[in-house]
């Protein structure tokens, strides 16, 4: 425990001290006091440097003194023979004796008292920056007017921090400007403007005089500007060394003025103002800015419009323009958006046609649609060439964005029919000669494909079976062949309204309006063995004359068999109706006069016994198109006859073209349109 005073005596004092002794005393007085140690008696064996016996006084790491020998007071009024004054509150006294004493020595008597120290004067380092005040047991620092004592209780500074400037314009100066600024101060000024405005600082060279840098170039007093993560300065010296206009690019600025204890100058004065935060005029390719300005600042809004053929894609939505706002951080909103070339995407595929994979699907690219020739052609024109337009659509000069339509080429057989090995009444044929030929298996009959969805046949073929099974693409109707061919599934059968339905069809004598249409569930794919026949035109060019030749085909009865295995065909001339009337009906089911002959019927045959027969019904009587010799049209449909191998009667298709077209239009599907 610290004490204010005390006594220290050598061992056995006042008797002689023993040999070989080492003893120490730790003196401690309260904080803020020094120690006054004085000896009133000293009788210790004398030796050079007190090497044998000694009393040693140590303060910290410093030896304050080492004593031996005899001393007596010089002052008759004072008993003190030796004294020490230390400005510290701790002291150590160490007594040592060696192994022998030539005489009898009595040692020492000493006393210590706590004494006040003057911190203001007793030390090399002055404890206070300005005024030092001593008192018993301590000291305190004080400051001149307008200064305040810092938290360390030693340093004085001016109260120059804490000011926050929020006005859009202002002036700030160092304390006492233009008088010398206070030493040993740290002044912090804060400028806080509304977001979207940047602080711009302006100084004049002559308004700045701050203690210059040392030889190493370090400012002793300094002015620093801090804006976010950017720093301007430190600045010092005579005349402002930095830029006279500082654009901080921030709405918040901290000004820090740091001074040391020496070298005060007049200081500095600055002006600041808030500029709306500028946003850079960015180069956004393929676009136009509206309004166009030399400089854009906070809250400015521009509309960025893409040039034709370019679009801004955000998510999955494409737009031709977007708005961008100059934000408070000096950056444009929507800055990620860019005008990219319009992408028309992979072109849609078309039925029965193709489009080459484009090298590019971007604005300006060109693609070409083609139809699967020679079985399909482009119905709606336009040449099939499309370019990627500015609106993101593939556009054709004629059709616009409408896709081309590939429709079957009609009436063109892949191989022309030639009457080769002669068979009585007809020839073997290949389905490629008559690709429109449709086979009905129940009843055994024929039909003619007129487009992807429709089969034309005789009414008497379908009147008893409204769900006929049909096949296309096979020359042979053997089971193994039909299994490989295309089976057609009917959706609906349309019998001509003029066809009279009978309770006993076997006794029919009236075959007027013997025509029907079968709508298919699925479109037929055309190719070398499957292709439609054309319909007759409505002009007089399509009026048949006696002697005009037509082709018939089918799997009907031949001389040898009831049903042909392979397709048979014959070339027949048109004959006057009376020729058909004159032939005696082979197995009449009624009086010969009861059989009806009308202008809706064509009579043909009579040459070399070539004729259609049972099982050929519904097949086409195909005549060369008068306006296009490469094509055939269905002039007639095998209907009935008085006797096989003579003349036959065919439904005159030209008389039914309007009904055919109307029925097909009224019963088309959106897919077909």
């Amino acid at each position: 425990e610290p004490t204010m005073y005390g006594e220290i005596l050598s061992p056995n004092y006042p008797q002689a001290y023993p040999s070989e002794v080492e003893k120490s005393w730790d003196i401690e007085v309260p904080e803020g006091y020094g120690i006054h140690l004085y000896f009133t008696h000293l009788d210790i064996e004398l030796s050079e440097n007190c090497a044998y016996d000694s009393v040693q006084i140590i303060s910290g790491d410093t030896e304050e003194g080492r004593l031996c020998g005899q001393r007596s007071s010089n002052n008759p009024h004072s008993p003190i023979v030796e004294e020490f004054q230390v400005p510290y509150n701790k002291l150590q006294v160490i007594f040592k004796s060696d192994f022998s004493n030539e005489e009898r020595f009595t040692g020492f008597a000493a006393y210590y008292v706590a004494t006040d120290i003057n911190e203001c004067t007793d030390f090399v380092d002055v404890p206070c920056s300005h005024f030092c005040n001593n008192f018993i047991g301590g000291y305190f620092c004080s400051c001149p007017p307008e200064y305040f004592l810092h938290d360390d209780m030693k340093n004085c500074g001016v109260n120059c921090s804490g000011d926050v400037f929020t006005a859009l314009i202002g002036e700030i100066a160092s304390p006492n400007y233009p008088k010398p600024y206070p030493e040993n101060s740290r002044c912090e000024y804060q400028i806080r403007l509304e977001k979207g405005f940047q602080v711009v600082v302006t100084l004049r060279r002559e308004d700045f005089d701050v203690e210059a840098a040392d030889s190493a170039g370090n400012c002793l007093d300094s002015l620093v500007f801090v804006a976010g993560d950017r720093q301007f300065g430190p600045y010092c010296g005579h005349g402002f060394p930095g830029p006279l206009n500082i654009e901080t690019k921030s709405n918040a600025l901290d000004i820090i003025f740091q001074t040391d204890l020496t070298g005060q100058k007049k200081g500095w004065k600055l002006r600041y103002h808030g500029d709306p935060m500028p946003c850079p005029k960015e180069d956004t390719p393929n676009s136009v800015w509206e309004p166009a300005k030399a400089k854009y600042v906070f809250r400015d809004v521009v509309q960025i419009t893409c040039l034709d053929g370019f679009e801004v894609v955000e998510g999955r939505v494409g737009a031709t323009s977007f708005y961008s706002t100059c934000q408070s951080n000096g950056k444009w909103s929507n800055s990620k958006l860019k005008c990219q070339p319009v992408d028309c995407g992979i072109p849609e595929s078309i039925e029965n046609g193709k489009v080459e994979d484009p090298e590019s699907t971007l604005f300006g690219s060109v693609i070409r649609y083609t139809c699967e020739e020679p079985y399909y052609y482009m119905e709606n024109g336009g040449g099939g060439e499309y370019h990627c337009a500015g609106n993101g659509s593939w556009v054709n000069e004629v059709l616009g964005p409408e896709l081309p339509k590939c429709v079957p080429v009609c009436g063109v057989p892949r191989e022309p029919f030639e009457e080769k090995q002669r068979i009585i009444g007809g020839s073997d044929a290949d389905i490629k000669n008559f690709p429109w030929q449709v086979f009905f298996d129940n009843p055994w009959a024929g039909g003619a494909l007129i487009n992807e969805y429709w089969v034309l046949t005789a009414a008497h073929v379908v009147e008893g079976n409204r769900e006929p099974t049909m096949y296309v693409g096979s020359t042979s109707v053997q089971t193994s062949r039909l299994a490989k061919s295309k089976m057609l599934t009917p959706e609906h059968v349309f019998i001509h309204p003029g066809w009279k339905l009978l309770e006993v069809p076997e006794g029919r004598t009236n075959f007027d309006n013997d025509i029907a249409l079968v709508r298919l569930k699925d479109p037929v794919k055309m190719g070398p063995t499957v292709s439609p026949i054309c319909l007759p035109g409505t002009s007089s060019d399509y009026n048949l004359m006696d002697g005009d030749l037509g082709l018939i085909s089918g799997w009907g009865r031949t001389e040898k068999r009831d049903r042909a295995v392979r397709l048979k065909a014959a070339r027949l001339p048109v004959a006057p109706l009376r020729k058909c009337k004159e032939v005696k009906v082979e197995k009449p089911t009624a009086d010969a006069e009861a059989y009806v002959f009308t202008p809706n019927m064509i009579c043909a045959g009579g040459e070399k016994g070539m004729d259609s027969c049972k099982g050929d019904s519904g097949g086409a009587f195909a005549v060369q198109d008068p306006n296009d010799k490469t094509k055939f049209y269905a002039a007639g449909l095998v209907s009935w006859g008085p006797q096989c191998g003579t003349y036959g009667l065919y439904t005159r298709v030209k008389n039914y073209v309007d009904w055919i077209m109307k029925t097909m239009q009224e019963n088309s599907t959106p897919r077909e349109d």
Epitope: V477, T479, S480, A483, K560
Partner: antibody, heavy 119, light 107 residues
Framework: QVQLVQSGAEVKKPGASVKVSCKVS????????MHWVRQAPGKGLEWMGT????????IYAQKFQGRVTMTEDTSTDTAYMELSSLRSEDTAVYYC????????????WGQGTLVTVSS | DIQMTQSPSTLSASVGDRVTITCRAS??????LAWYQQKPGKAPKLLIY???SLESGVPSRFSGSGSGTEFTLTISSLQPDDFATYYC?????????FGQGTKVEIK
């Protein structure tokens, strides 16, 4: 009326060959597709092959490939089926059959020829 | 090759019973399937063609159904003349394979 008349029964030793004929009457062979079917005693029916006039090729069942040969003589309207490397399991009644039309598998069947393979 | 699997192999039934025989194809054969009846020592007789079409002259108690891979032959009321072996056959593509047969015998 179409008829198929087959050659008579045969007895053959293992490893030998047999050639069965089938004569068409009432029609021409060129108009028909001839198939061959066999049936071992107490066993099921096995399709052996046919001549496909459309493709102009003979199609053999995988099981008989390499051992069977089917030929036609259109001048006599006769079809032939030759089976070589005979083994006891080839003992069967062999039928020639004409292919039917429009879904009918077989139209006319021959009376069958019994081939017995025995050592 | 398309495999045809018939079930059951043997079926014991009485006169007047309703009998169903199943035929399964290893892949789709659409409707290209035929059913035959065969009696000992005789050539097979066609009953049904194109899966469901009845051959002319065949009694209406015989009927066929199915398409794709699953087919059935039904005899609505078994008659004494119907005890025989029945075969299915696919004619969709070569090889024209037969089922292994179903023997219908008197219970």
């Amino acid at each position: 009326q179409v008829q198929l008349v087959q050659s008579g029964a045969e007895v053959k030793k293992p490893g030998a060959s047999v050639k069965v004929s089938c004569k068409v009457s009432g029609d021409t062979l060129t108009e028909l597709s001839m198939h061959w079917v066999r049936q071992a005693p107490g066993k099921g029916l096995e399709w052996m092959g046919t001549f496909d006039p459309e493709e102009g090729e003979t199609i053999y069942a995988q099981k008989f490939q390499g051992r069977v040969t089917m030929t036609e003589d259109t001048s006599t309207d006769t079809a032939y089926m030759e089976l070589s490397s005979l083994r006891s399991e080839d003992t069967a009644v062999y039928y020639c059959v004409t292919e039917g039309l429009a879904g009918f598998p077989f139209d006319i069947w021959g009376q069958g020829t019994l081939v017995t393979v025995s050592s | 090759d398309i495999q045809m699997t018939q079930s059951p192999s043997t079926l014991s039934a009485s006169v007047g019973d309703r009998v169903t025989i199943t035929c399964r194809a290893s892949q789709s054969i659409s409707s290209w399937l035929a059913w035959y009846q065969q009696k000992p020592g005789k050539a097979p007789k066609l009953l049904i063609y194109k899966a469901s079409s009845l051959e002319s002259g065949v009694p209406s108690r015989f009927s066929g159904s199915g398409s794709g891979t699953e087919f059935t032959l039904t005899i609505s009321s078994l008659q004494p003349d119907d005890f025989a072996t029945y075969y299915c056959q696919q004619v969709n593509s070569y090889d024209w394979t037969f089922g292994q047969g179903t023997k219908v015998e008197i219970k």
